[in-house]
Amino acid sequence: QAAPFPELCSYTWEAVDTKNNVLYKINICGSVDIVQCGPSSAVCMHLLKTRTYHSVGDSVLRSATRSLLEFNTTVSCDQQGTNHRVQSSIAFLCGKTLGTPEFVTATECVHYFEWRTTAACKKDIFKANKEVPCYVFDEELRKHDLNPLIKLSGAYLVDDSDPDTSLFINVCRDIDTLRDPGSQLRACPPGTAACLVRGHQAFDVGQPRDGLKVVRKDRLVLSYVREEAGKLDFCDGHSPAVTITFVCPSERREGTIPKLTAKSNCRYEIEWITEYACHRDYLESKTCSLSGEQQDVSIDLTPLAQSGGSSYISDGKEYLFYLNVCGETEIQFCNKKQAAVCQVKKSDTSQVKAAGRYHNQTLRYSDGDLTLIYFGGDECSSGFQRMSVINFECNKTAGNDGKGTPVFTGEVDCTYFFTWDTEYACVHHHHHH
């Protein structure tokens, strides 16, 4: 039986049940390399409290559909008096990066995971030439996730004092230049995640090979190497390589530019101070507020919730968008879709799509950007579920009693972008460091 998601096969992935202090290792095509789980375990559960291991999914007992992967075991479990077997169930959804398996819940018998990944899309539009896992768990099992930094198009310029060269990088995947045929970036070879431009020539100085690593709690490392043989003539016989160290700052700050800290014989060392390197709970909340000692800030968008069936309306040329954020009030137009953002076609108001649902909500404050994300909307033809990204700006003089109003800014591959100027986005910082 062929592997259902070949792009995910090269790595052993991790997921965590934080509530119960459980680390899962997942290898969807072969087996995880953990002796205590046996030679054919595809899903190995490590109970950190008791320091014990159990296989909760056997690679031999795999069954797959386009969107669901199940690994059974021969271990019995008692669920309401019936004799079941322990199993793991991974639900796959289309995403724009390789993504990460997320632990959902576990019963006596079944361990449930969800994975939004390019590997599950119906079309290849989001697939990279080369991409590696872009998250890591630290020793306290806290997740550090750089997926939001991955550019699907374009690159980051590395700050370098050399006026004759430009070093471009992407995070965890190769650079896609197709959307910008006119720039210097266009000359970069396919597959490169680190591209050095000198004059009119561009050179591959590194491709992703291994996933993100944690060196200590607040420092993450990504290494790129040039896969091709054939040395570059300006590298003095050495093979090019790039090391990017992502550093979580000691207190809240605006984002910074990746900086070249050392360069020798085509070995490039880059340091990037960014809050995306911090653990995810520092940056994100499933509610509409971020506060407390853990986050160093106080943000509360709940006053933006609309009551009494009214919604914010944002004009998107062909479409009208109805938004009801930070609540669970049904949008009247949206046919009981549990939508936080609802897209209605102006020329045919019966064409209604959920562009993100209110129970799929993430509030993120990172590198000075405050963003509210709604995902899990109606599917597009690619298989990607529509989602909405609302970028908030602090405006103490916003109209509508300080609430302001969302403005639709555009759509990229079934992701809808809005900006929203409001006094409720004015962030209060706690300086307790």
Epitope: K151, S153, G154, A155, Y156, L157, D159, S166, F168, T177, R179, D180, P181, G182, S183, Q184, L185, R186, E254, G255, I257, P258, G368, D369, N391, E393, T409, G410, E411, V412, F417, T419
Partner: nanobody, 123 residues
Framework: QVQLQESGGGLVQAGGSLRLSCEAS????????WGWFRQAPGKEREFVAA????????SYADSVKGRFTISRDNAKNTIYLQMNSLKPEDTAVYYC????????????????WGQGTQVTVSS
């Protein structure tokens, strides 16, 4: 690829103000970072100001800091450059440009350009 069209240039006295506009069409507004550049006769094209697509973060050339303001109206797919306290040395053709590179002010990293609009500041 995105298409850009500048407007708003003209002749103004030193100390005066102008507001340049740049309307974008074609590819989506949302995947690009935006910049204003200028080129005076016989000189290289130089960076003036930039704004990131994903937020309203801005950067400015030292020579215009405090006098020029870059902004955008996403609903209209338009970038603006508000120029106050203009000086004769601000005389140039002003170009709007779009880039898929984050954190850059280098004109060669901008793949889409407008035709430019002339700004002349008389003393």
């Amino acid at each position: 690829q995105v298409q850009l069209q500048e407007s708003g240039g003209g002749l103004v006295q030193a100390g005066g103000s102008l507001r340049l506009s740049c309307e974008a069409s074609g590819r989506t507004f949302n995947t690009y970072n935006w910049g204003w550049f200028r080129q005076a006769p016989g000189k290289e094209r130089e960076f003036v100001a930039a704004i990131r697509w994903s937020s309203s973060k801005t950067s400015y050339a030292d020579s215009v800091k405090g006098r020029f303001t870059i902004s955008r109206d996403n609903a209209k797919n338009t970038i603006y450059l508000q120029m106050n306290s203009l000086k004769p040395e601000d005389t140039a053709v002003y170009y709007c440009a779009a880039s898929i590179v984050d954190f850059t002010t280098n004109p060669s990293h901008f793949g889409s350009w407008g035709q430019g609009t002339q700004v002349t500041v008389s003393s």
